[in-house]
């Protein structure tokens, strides 16, 4: 349905406040480097103008595009050029290009201060002088840190920030009722801008009918008594909103997931009976838990699924009218019998399924040729839960710390040319998949696992490809999305790298390393690790983890010392000669 | 684009072999079945067998099975048919043709005349 | 193996002239598939899955039929559709053609 003017339509859906904050969003995860004022000043105009559209639809510029009117409003910035180089080079075309040019420019990695936090006293009353600019610097600095960040579950995630300090500040022990909150909402928000960050590379790297079949192997498993023209027109509807987040197209995105959620409520009967408690929540917090809802019970007696896929005469007739349609069907069939899958799994059996029928419908003698084709499938379930039992069982024996480090070598010597903080980073979170996912029955570690570093490793993908480096990782992240973890799985040490020159500054340690938190003195230790491996590759785990456990005993050593600087200056020059010593460098 | 370009014509003594070849160009030659075709002179058109390069599999017509051998190269894309103990019978033109779903052949090579003659 | 009968071996027509061949299964076949062969060069596949007209066939073609019954229709006759055109069935091992119906211009 056209509205005359598109920026009325959405602001009237929308309402001022949760208009005004995604297009802070809109702007802020495009001109990352701007300062707050500036894009508050910005908000400001659009938000006024897009009054004057209420007011009167057939106003000057009214009728434009928000890509145009947005765009327009970017390139007023006046100091594009200086700021941002040739990214100013976007305001010179047109939309739909202009728009195109701004995505490419989005920067997963910009180069920003870390966010520190305040003492608790300094946050409280900044959030009672002026809560609406307290928000909104909140939603600011998350959004040009995490250019990808799902625009309305970071209205969410403000709302829950809201809440914490409206709580927390009257509370008689502030920083106690505070500190885990805000440490929660850390966690959960850098959790779901990997997520979403999967979800665009997915639908910008790999294309719409990638994004689909991803969206009916989850929903399928989701909402198994669901008919499939039910669970398909989710996906559709589903696609489009994630379409429009991930194109910058916040307001339509927010407003449609808004609509996504309404209907799914208005459905239930049809779709899952787990969906009660969510629909009885208002809309933020409803689309949050739709999204998080729990699997439904499996209908009883499905019927194999060998009848309709491999026994019936109308396989290749059924396949040849509507293979999208058919491959569809097959997804959604394996995925809502099969909630102990991953949904890359999922995938790669469609893939298998899909391949065998386009050479197998070919063939003189089709039902000879596809006959077995369940039994290609074997090979692809025990590959993923060997490998989670194997890792799970070294989590368990090892602890977090220790596997992550595991890891880290692992990956080191699979990839050795990758950026030093990438690799601690992303080695870091692929080892939070045992204290994630090993506590699982069975029945659900593959799902929690493989979907988590399919995740991670695309945050490896996307920090490399700003970057690249290695052609290996490029052939990992670009051939297939969904062999992704395998072929990272299956990559042995890379012979061809010429190891690093050793270079001592790598190993000096300072008595600061003693005032930092247990998380950021673990990050120091992996990133000396990693320089380790890099500097020798063919280093034995045994050779690794003594020169490891001497780092850890000279630190503590250190920390203790009366005289931390000298301890870490004597004692380091001889940790790294017998370092040298013991790794031949 | 797709062709299929089948090596030369053949006078062969009857009791020998003779190797025919397919050179495929254009299109993912792994992923479609090669056929093999039959067409005596003033005759219909008989089939002989199929491979899918991908894998190897084959498919043979039960007429020609010990008398045909078809087999593929990935590296040169290209498809054989060897043809074994030849008599007069086997004079024929003979052509490749690249199989796609549901059975039809889309391109076919241009033939190769096999004489069989002492 | 399935046998296909088609009919008439030769038929000629006139230009203008609607001509219709046909292709009997000797046992039900899934689809059906016709070729079009002048003298000195390959088959050239002509309709496809029963009824789909191969790229560059002119829109004057058309393919029908189900189970046993198939049949090629031209529904005005030019002086290039003159040849043979053959029938093969896809959908039992082995794969079998007809022995052509021969087309020619009256």
């Known amino acids: 349905d056209a509205h005359k003017s598109e920026v009325a339509h959405r602001f009237k859906d929308l309402g001022e406040e949760n208009f005004k904050a995604l297009v802070l969003i809109a702007f802020a995860q495009y001109l990352q480097q701007c300062p707050f004022e500036d894009h508050v000043k910005l908000v400001n105009e659009v938000t006024e103008f897009a009054k004057t559209c209420v007011a009167d639809e057939s106003a000057e510029n009214c009728d434009k595009s928000l890509h145009t009117l947005f765009g327009d409003k970017l390139c007023t910035v006046a100091t594009l050029r200086e700021t941002y180089g040739e990214m100013a080079d976007c305001c010179a075309k047109q939309e739909p290009e202009r728009n195109e040019c701004f995505l490419q420019h989005k920067d997963d990695n910009p180069n920003l201060p870390r966010l520190v936090r305040p003492e608790v006293d300094v946050m409280c009353t900044a959030f009672h002088d002026n809560e609406e600019t307290f928000l909104k610097k909140y939603l600011y600095e998350i959004a040009r840190r995490h250019p990808y960040f799902y625009a309305p579950e970071l209205l969410f995630f403000a709302k829950r920030y809201k809440a914490a300090f409206t709580e927390c500040c009257q509370a008689a022990d502030k920083a106690a009722c505070l500190l885990p909150k805000l440490d929660e909402l850390r966690d959960e928000g850098k959790a779901s801008s990997a997520k979403q960050r999967l979800k665009c590379a997915s639908l910008q790297k790999f294309g719409e009918r990638a994004f689909k079949a991803w969206a009916v192997a989850r929903l399928s498993q989701r909402f198994p008594k669901a008919e499939f023209a039910e669970v398909s027109k989710l996906v559709t509807d589903l696609t489009k909103v994630h379409t429009e987040c991930c194109h910058g197209d916040l307001l339509e995105c927010a407003d449609d997931r808004a609509d996504l959620a309404k209907y799914i409520c208005e459905n239930q009967d049809s779709i899952s009976s787990k969906l009660k408690e969510c629909c009885e929540k208002p809309l933020l917090e409803k689309s949050h838990c739709i999204a998080e809802v729990e699997n439904d019970e499996m209908p009883a007696d499905l019927p194999s699924l060998a009848a309709d896929f491999v026994e019936s005469k109308d396989v290749c007739k059924n396949y040849a009218e509507a293979k999208d349609v058919f491959l569809g069907m097959f997804l959604y069939e394996y995925a809502r019998r099969h909630p102990d899958y991953s949904v890359v799994l999922l995938l790669r059996l469609a893939k298998t399924y899909e391949t065998t029928l386009e050479k197998c419908c070919a063939a003189a003698d089709p039902h000879e040729c596809y006959a077995k084709v369940f039994d290609e499938f074997k090979p692809l379930v025990e590959e993923p839960q060997n490998l989670i039992k194997q890792n799970c069982e070294l989590f368990e024996q090892l602890g977090e710390y220790k596997f992550q480090n595991a890891l880290l070598v692992r990956y080191t010597k699979k990839v050795p040319q990758v950026s030093t903080p990438t690799l601690v980073e992303v080695s870091r979170n692929l080892g939070k998949v045992g204290s994630k996912c090993c506590k699982h029955p069975e029945a659900k570690r593959m799902p929690c696992a493989e979907d988590y570093l399919s995740v991670v490793l695309n945050q490896l993908c996307v920090l490399h490809e700003k970057t690249p480096v290695s052609d290996r990782v490029t052939k990992c992240c670009t051939e297939s999305l969904v062999n992704r973890r395998p072929c990272f799985s299956a990559l042995e040490v890379d012979e061809t790298y010429v190891p690093k020159e050793f270079n001592a500054e790598t190993f000096t340690f300072h008595a600061d390393i003693c005032t930092l938190s247990e998380k950021e003195r673990q990050i120091k230790k992996q990133t000396a690790l990693v320089e380790l491996v890099k500097h020798k590759p063919k280093a034995t785990k045994e050779q690794l983890k003594a020169v490891m456990d001497d780092f850890a005993a000279f630190v503590e050593k250190c920390c203790k010392a009366d005289d931390k600087e000298t301890c870490f200056a004597e004692e380091g020059k001889k940790l790294v000669a017998a370092s040298q010593a013991a790794l031949g460098l | 684009q797709v062709q299929l370009q089948q090596s030369g014509a053949e006078l062969v003594r009857p009791g020998s072999s003779v190797k025919i070849s397919c050179k495929a160009s254009?299109?993912?030659?792994?992923?479609?079945?090669m056929n093999w075709v039959k067409q005596r002179p003033g005759q219909g058109l008989e089939w002989i067998g199929q491979?899918?390069?991908?894998?190897?599999?084959?498919y043979y017509n039960g007429r020609f099975k010990g008398k045909a051998t078809i087999t593929a190269d990935k590296s040169p894309t290209t498809a054989y048919m060897q043809l074994s103990s030849l008599t007069s019978e086997d004079s024929a033109v003979y052509v490749c043709?690249?199989?796609?779903?549901?059975?039809?052949?889309?391109?076919w090579g241009q033939g190769t005349t096999l004489t069989v003659s002492s | 193996q399935i046998v296909l009968t088609q009919s008439p071996a030769i038929m000629s027509a006139s230009p203008g002239e609607k001509v219709t061949m046909t292709c009997s299964a000797s046992?039900?076949?899934?689809?059906m598939h016709w070729y079009q062969q002048k003298s000195g060069t390959s088959p050239k596949r002509w309709i496809y899955?029963?009824?789909k007209l191969a790229s560059g066939v002119p829109v004057r073609f058309s393919g029908s039929g189900s189970g046993t019954s198939y049949s090629l229709t031209i529904r005005s006759m030019e002086a290039e559709d003159a040849a043979t055109y053959y029938c093969?069935?896809?959908?039992?091992?082995?794969?079998?053609f007809g022995a052509g119906t021969k087309l020619e211009l009256k």
């Open positions: 043709a690249r199989g796609v779903l549901l059975g039809s052949f889309d391109y």
């Open positions: 254009g299109y993912a030659f792994s992923n479609y079945w």
């Open positions: 491979i899918y390069p991908g894998d190897g599999d084959t």
């Open positions: 046992s039900s076949v899934s689809y």
């Open positions: 899955d029963t009824s």
């Open positions: 093969q069935q896809w959908g039992s091992n082995p794969l079998t």
